[in-house]
Amino acid sequence: CKAMHVAQPAVVLASSRGIASFVCEYASPGKATEVRVTVLRQADSQVTEVCAATYMMGNELTFLDDSICTGTSSGNQVNLTIQGLRAMDTGLYICKVELMYPPPYYLGIGNGTQIYVIDPEPCPDSDF
């Protein structure tokens, strides 16, 4: 089967500081040296790009300076961290993997990770 399977966890709960991490793993049908990983957010049938990075196998992922994502790679596994999340950012975060080089190109899209974000309660004023 000329397809690339992408696996990611079904659900992740963001920390109280608005940080969520998950692993995106892909079964590579070819021996790619250049890989692009994109995180898409799907909410209310709207899809937006959260972040994207292209990396050479064996090297670190490089996101843009203003990206809310960071990540590391190990073989066919990418560890993604999204920060600065608030309750309104709750949604389905989809990992998309593209094997860019050498040809042939392969596309793999995960089923998505539902990230739940709960805004922390404000600290009550102290009477002391």
Partner: antibody, heavy 118, light 108 residues
């Protein structure tokens, strides 16, 4: 709204060259893969070439490899197809098309006709 | 290269009838990466279905897609006059991107 407008088609003799352009508007070109797809008169659709994101990665159909070059100028939001050593069998309507988030071709231009004839 | 074979080549039906178009792949295609397009004379193709069964934006619900592995189907539940056109399937999971040869749906 998303719009793709091709230009540069025309009648050319075998062995000659032609450059097609596709002006994109309504979206940021650098965030999308862009393809050229062609359709010979009365025939089906045939994929020609693709350029990805920053333009560093490209793929070509075997039928055009070594003769056609796809490129993009993201600052001008324009896609190109340089066609050299044209053959009669390259006669077709050439469409530029955008790849959406899911990898599918979601928007197409109106096409530009290239006729290779002596 | 994944070869897609569509059948029948031509489908002659009347408005209001059900149309069933088939697309068979030479090797297994993930259903996530199978699309259907509609093309009318003198016009560019228009995306109908992606991921084998998801309707593109603005596509009426009389169009539906199904299938997995090597066999995929596009169904038009009740043909409207504007549905008479040529339909192409496409796989987009790996290069080279390939299309079926098309099925023409014509008025009987």
């Amino acid at each position: 709204q998303v719009q793709l407008v091709e230009s540069g088609g025309g009648v050319v003799q075998p062995g000659r060259s032609l450059r097609l352009s596709c002006a994109a508007s309504g979206f940021t070109l650098s965030r999308y893969g862009m393809h050229w797809v062609r359709q010979a008169p009365g025939k089906g659709l045939e994929w020609v070439a693709v350029t990805w994101y920053d333009g560093s990665n490209k793929n070509y159909a075997d039928s055009v490899k070594g003769r056609f070059t796809i490129s993009r100028d993201n600052s001008k939001n324009t896609l190109y197809l340089q066609m050299n050593s044209l053959r009669v069998e390259d006669t077709a309507v050439y469409y530029c098309t955008r790849v959406d988030w899911w990898g599918v071709f979601d928007f197409w231009g109106q096409g530009t006709l290239v006729t290779v004839s002596s | 290269e994944i070869v897609l074979t569509q059948s029948p080549g031509t489908l002659s039906l009347s408005p209001g009838e059900r149309a069933t178009l088939s697309c068979r792949a030479s090797q297994s295609v993930s259903s996530s990466y199978l699309a259907w397009y509609q093309q009318k004379p003198g016009q560019a193709p228009r995306l109908l279905i992606y991921g084998a069964s998801s309707r593109a934006t603005g596509i009426p619900d009389r169009f539906s897609g199904s299938g997995s592995g090597t066999d995929f189907t596009l169904t038009i539940s009740r043909l409207e006059p504007e549905d008479f056109a040529v339909y192409y399937c496409q796989q987009y999971g790996s290069s080279p991107w390939t299309f079926g040869q098309g099925t023409k749906v014509e008025i009987k």
